[in-house]
Amino acid sequence: SETTTGTSSNSSQSTSNSGLAPNPTNATTK
């Protein structure tokens, strides 16, 4: 569940989680 930065009614900012994958897995070893 990614959220986007914005302003809510109580003037708190929403942190943008959009820079990170929602269900990350470990990088494959090559």
């Epitope: 809510s8 989680n17 494959t28």
Partner: antibody, heavy 115, light 112 residues
Framework: EVQFVESGGGLVQPGGSLKLSCAAS????????MDWVRQASGKGLEWVAE??????????YYAESVKGRFTISRDDSKSTAYLQMNSLKTEDTAVYYC??????WGQGTLVTVSS | DIVMTQTPLSLSVTIGQPASISCKSS???????????LNWLLQKPGQSPKRLIY???KLDPGIPDRFSGSGSETDFTLKISRVEAEDVGIYYC?????????FGGGTKVEIK
């Protein structure tokens, strides 16, 4: 204004423990995925740990270098994230930043591990 | 782990001139949802890092539009169309597609 304020850093001997805190304000903390990132003096950035939000079951992730020694946690009622650091090593010496999923960042707290 | 390689290591730019930083990842950053989790951050001298761009090209709120990001898969670029004095610092690319999250080594931008 969004603020993340870290505290709890200091000087500790190898093998010792510290608990870092990150108090958030001006942000909907309960929605934030919280990370700790560290930076040794004059070096680059290294990700340490992450804890996600309630809809994501507060799942946690750790860097291999701290797995089994560090524990990330959060208290949404206090808008605070924590990093419990045990069995500290000299190579853990760094400024530790808390960040909301790499979006907002705190000013950092210095952890020095030395005998 | 995904290795993030930035070039150049440092960059000396005249105010008003453009600047470009390259970031290459050792594996594709394209995630299964079709999004690419490549971020750019700036750490100004004596300050904590600040994110400029996420998902390759999306500017964070309050970031001037002289900054732009592009690229796909493993090759990414940050461009500053006209460098200003306040742009000095160390720029980092960072991938958020696969654990562990990893950062590039940084590119130091200074003014000539």
């Amino acid at each position: 204004e969004v603020q993340f304020v870290e505290s709890g850093g200091g000087l500790v001997q190898p093998g010792g423990s510290l608990k870092l805190s990150c108090a958030a304000s001006g942000v909907t903390f309960s929605e934030a995925w919280m990370d700790w990132v560290r930076q040794a003096s004059g070096k680059g950035l290294e990700w340490v740990a992450e804890i996600r939000d309630k809809p994501n079951s507060y799942v946690t992730y750790y860097a291999e270098s701290v797995k089994g020694r560090f524990t990330i946690s959060r208290d949404d009622s206090k808008s605070t994230a924590y990093l419990q650091m045990n069995s500290l090593k000299t190579e853990d010496t760094a400024v530790y930043y808390c960040t909301g999923a790499m979006d907002y960042w705190g000013q950092g707290t210095l952890v020095t591990v030395s005998s | 782990d995904i290795v993030m390689t930035q070039t150049p290591l440092s960059l000396s730019v005249t105010i008003g001139q453009p600047a470009s930083i390259s970031c290459k990842s050792s594996q594709s950053l394209l995630y299964s949802n079709g999004k690419t989790y490549l971020n750019w951050l700036l750490q100004k001298p004596g300050q904590s890092p600040k994110r400029l761009i996420y998902q390759v090209s999306k500017l964070d709120p309050g970031i001037p539009d002289r900054f732009s990001g592009s690229g796909s898969e493993t090759d990414f670029t940050l461009k500053i169309s006209r460098v200003e004095a306040e742009d000095v610092g160390i720029y980092y690319c960072m991938q958020g597609s696969s654990l562990p999250w990893t950062f590039g080594g940084g590119t130091k931008v200074e003014i000539k």
